[in-house]
């Protein structure tokens, strides 16, 4: 089957800065802000756009290894992320791929709201479990709470 | 620039059959999940069917089970939709549609291709 | 199957209005609902995802709101391209369904 999951997270980071180093700069940043969770982000293909893959390597005493992930839009001017996971210990036995979205816009008040839209491919018609859905959206709050701190204490970068 | 061009409508008997084409351009059309939307005339919009990117999950409307077939050919990047037993209610324009990647809204449509079942 | 309800059917409203169309769930359908826009003779186009988000190149005057069963369209100040149907679409379960459509028409 097919699942859709819908969150938003938001942000005292304004979009275009945290879109800057969360979503462009993710590669490098994430593993330095987060390496409890992330050890390493490997470009194994492709220039950062549209086709490119990367191999995403977890850190010790997290649950997952690895997994595979191929970029499928980068749309600068509109604060918007496209992205598939296409392999690894991630999708389990049941999952074929996952798809998410992540588009951050401008809060009324100042900061931003990451929106992230996720659709869940299950092999047969097999459901997903709430719980794998939700997790996921918990591991992207993770990282991003990793970034904010990180931009908070390093006020000169990515202006 | 995505485009999605349907064809194969016209006028059918009732029982007759027909089969749609969809063909796509200006994105990888084996990475997205598809749809075919009807509107018969005059009415609202109406979901008939949708076939996965990989063609593992396929569901319907319970009005169409039984008669029409959605099927895709990756290498051609081409969607199609074989109806069988056509009734008079099947009479409306018939557009495929393209399912976002993270989500399962309809991001872009053909411009549709009418079938008239009519004795 | 999930029912969605749309109103009003039709809206007669004068240019610069703001406009608000309604889309109610039969029941929850968490975030996962589009909303679309249909002029005469052409496709449907894609306006708002995911209840709230803007669709690319959707005009910053429409925006969605809401989640569970009810939702709202907004157009902050209606321009003379916007006189169309607009369709509300829920995609958290099988089969997807589509509302039966608001006409916003010019006064």
């Known amino acids: 089957g097919v699942f859709n999951y819908e969150a938003e997270t938001p942000s005292v980071i304004p979009a275009a800065r945290l879109f800057k180093s969360y979503v462009l700069d993710g590669d490098k940043l994430i593993p330095k802000v987060a390496p409890q969770v992330i050890s390493s982000v490997e470009n194994v293909g492709g220039n950062g756009g549209p086709g490119t893959i990367k191999n995403i390597t977890f850190a010790e005493g997290i649950p997952f290894k690895f997994v595979k992930e191929r970029v499928d839009e980068v749309d600068n001017a509109n604060f918007k992320y496209n992205y598939t996971v296409i392999e690894g210990d991630v999708l389990g036995d049941k999952l074929e791929k996952v798809s998410h979205e992540l588009k951050i816009v401008a809060a009324p008040g100042g900061g931003s709201i990451v929106k992230i839209s996720s659709k869940f491919h299950a092999k047969g018609y097999h459901e997903v479990n709430a719980e794998k859905m939700k997790g996921a959206k918990e591991m992207a709050e993770k990282l991003l709470r990793a970034v904010e701190s990180y931009l908070l204490a390093h006020t000169a970068e990515y202006n | 620039e995505v485009q999605l061009v349907e064809s194969g409508g016209g006028l059918v008997q009732p029982g007759g059959s027909l089969r749609l084409s969809c063909v796509a351009s200006?994105?990888?059309?084996?990475?997205?999940?598809m749809n075919w939307v009807r509107q018969a005339p005059g009415e609202g919009l109406e979901w008939i069917s949708y076939?996965?990117?990989?063609?593992?999950?396929?569901y319907y409307i319970d009005s169409v089970k039984g008669r029409f077939t959605i099927s895709r050919d990756n290498a051609k990047n081409s969607l199609y939709l074989q109806m069988n037993s056509l009734r008079a209610e099947d009479t409306a324009i018939y557009y495929c549609a393209r399912e976002a990647l993270a989500s399962s809204s309809f991001d872009y449509w053909g411009q549709g291709t009418l079938v008239t079942v009519s004795s | 199957e999930i029912v969605m309800t749309q109103s009003p059917a039709t809206l007669s409203v004068s240019p610069g209005e703001r406009v608000t169309l309604s889309c109610r769930a039969s029941?929850?359908?968490?975030?996962?609902l589009a909303w679309y826009q249909q002029k005469p003779g052409q496709a449907p186009r894609l306006l708002i995802y995911?209840?709230?988000t803007g669709a690319t190149g959707v005009p910053a005057r429409f925006s969605g709101s809401g989640s569970g069963t009810e939702f709202t369209l907004t157009i902050s100040s209606l321009q003379s391209e916007d006189f169309a149907l607009y369709y509300c679409q829920q995609y958290n379960k099988w089969p997807r369904t589509i509302g039966q459509g608001t006409k916003v028409e010019i006064k």
């Open positions: 200006g994105f990888t059309f084996s990475n997205y999940d």
């Open positions: 029941q929850s359908v968490s975030g996962n």
């Open positions: 076939i996965s990117y990989s063609d593992h999950n396929i």
């Open positions: 995911s209840a709230s």
